[in-house]
């Protein structure tokens, strides 16, 4: 069952998942100047059975000359959101190690993919938070959020994390300075 909303936003922090539960959707988003091809699903889906899961549908982006019909209040320069290729590659290598029943690994990047991945998570999904570069984590508990179903409604638990200004970035569970990650699993790509 899909979570009704997105994981909580923590100031100066991003989140990511170890692996994605079956039923998770990843929107086929393209970078500026490109758009999703007209034939093909608007999203990839983590699907399969208890022994093997994989992403159904493939995202494809094509060049676009569409005129802009959105009034943008402040420009969002591409460089602000640019994802580092080397960072992506190392994250993909980590993701390759993940093999959880009923879960999918981080899907590989597609050509002209947008800089931010938009996921629709399902109940039971856990995401892990880390402070962005230049901020340090102060923990009051686990830096994670779980989508739970309560009385027919979905909600995300509140991660116990505060990010304060400092030079050293904190680490995701499974990286150089592990922080209470279940089974010490490596992480996949940032989804915020």
């Amino acid at each position: 069952e899909l979570c009704d909303d997105d994981p909580p936003k923590i100031t100066h922090a991003t989140f990511k998942a170890v692996a994605y539960k079956e039923g998770t959707m990843l929107n086929c988003e393209c970078k500026r100047g490109f758009r999703r091809i007209k034939s093909g699903s608007p999203y990839m889906l983590c699907t399969g059975n208890s022994s093997h899961s994989s992403w159904d549908n493939q995202c494809q982006c094509t060049s676009s000359a569409a005129r802009n019909t959105t009034k943008q209040v402040t420009p969002q320069p591409e460089e602000q959101k640019e994802r580092k290729t080397t960072e992506m590659q190392s994250q993909m290598q980590l993701a390759d190690q993940v093999s959880l029943p009923g879960h999918c690994r981080e899907p590989p990047p597609w050509e002209n993919e947008a800089t931010e991945r938009i996921y629709h998570f399902v109940v039971g999904q856990t995401v892990y938070y880390q402070c962005v570069q230049g901020y340090r984590a102060l923990h009051r508990g686990p830096a994670e959020s779980v989508c739970k179903m309560t009385h027919g409604k979905t909600r995300w638990t509140q991660p116990q994390l505060i990010c304060t200004g400092e030079t050293e970035p904190s680490q995701f569970p499974g990286e150089e300075e592990p922080q209470a990650s279940p089974d010490g699993l490596p992480e996949s790509e940032t989804s915020r």
Partner: antibody, heavy 114, light 107 residues
Framework: QIQLQQSGAELVRPGTSVKMSCKAA????????IGWVKQRPGHGLEWIGD????????NYNEKFKGKATLTADTSSSTADMQLSSLTSEDSAIYYC???????WGQGTLVTVSA | DIVMTQSQKFMSTSVGDRVSVTCKAS??????VAWYQQKPGQSPKALIY???YRYSGVPDRFTGSGSGTDFTLTISNVQSEDLAEYFC?????????FGGGTKLEIK
């Protein structure tokens, strides 16, 4: 809580235009496509088109090209649809929808009458 | 355009029964099919995405199945509140298209 709030009913003259709005709340407006769907009694549901507020990209059902114009304003998290050269065939309920059709507005009833 | 055909416009059932609403696509749409429920005077409500995955809050008596061209929405243990019209939709390619709808009547 995710909500799509649509503007109120419209009674309009044939040959004129009408603009309806869909205000999104409870999620990041620029991340998700907003679609528009037409419903007429006996005609089921018809997909008109969609718009990506983050990039301004639009897709239209060929049938509605020249009839519908989709726009979005990121400052107010509002998507608009304008229908032009109205005829009785345009009398219908129009829904906006988002997050891969998971959420629907309450609909805007448009009545075209002389 | 891909045509989605719901051959039964009306279906009659009783509380506690099991009923299956079918939908046929004019060409292969993979599993890119959704099901919606619309009660009189209300907006459509999303029930199923990707042919078989339930949205949150949808009772587990609603089950979707199928792939390719043939799809089914099954309601087991029908309740009086299931009185509604049910639509299928393909989003495999533009333009997205809906089935004509199947009205479920409770005897």
């Amino acid at each position: 809580q995710i909500q799509l709030q649509q503007s109120g009913a419209e009674l309009v003259r044939p040959g004129t235009s009408v603009k309806m709005s869909c205000k999104a709340a409870g999620y990041t407006f620029t991340n998700y496509w907003i679609g528009w769907v037409k419903q007429r009694p006996g005609h089921g549901l018809e997909w008109i088109g969609d718009i990506h507020p983050g990039g301004g990209y639009t897709n239209y059902n060929e049938k509605f090209k020249g009839k519908a114009t989709l726009t979005a304003d990121t400052s107010s998290s509002t998507a608009d649809m304008q229908l032009s050269s109205l005829t009785s065939e345009d009398s219908a309920i129009y829904y906006c929808t988002s997050r891969n059709f998971a959420y629907w507005g309450q609909g805007t009833l448009v009545t075209v009458s002389a | 355009d891909i045509v989605m055909t719901q051959s039964q416009k009306f279906m009659s059932t009783s509380v506690g029964d099991r009923v299956s609403v079918t939908c046929k696509a004019s060409q292969n749409v993979g599993i890119n099919v959704a099901w919606y429920q619309q009660k009189p005077g209300q907006s459509p409500k999303a029930l199923i995405y990707s042919a078989s995955y339930r949205y949150s809050g949808v009772p587990d008596r609603f089950t979707g199945s199928g792939s390719g061209t043939d799809f089914t929405l099954t309601i087991s243990n029908v309740q009086s509140e299931d009185l509604a019209e049910y639509f299928c939709q393909q989003y495999n390619s533009y333009p997205y298209t809906f089935g004509g709808g199947t009205k479920l009547e409770i005897k």
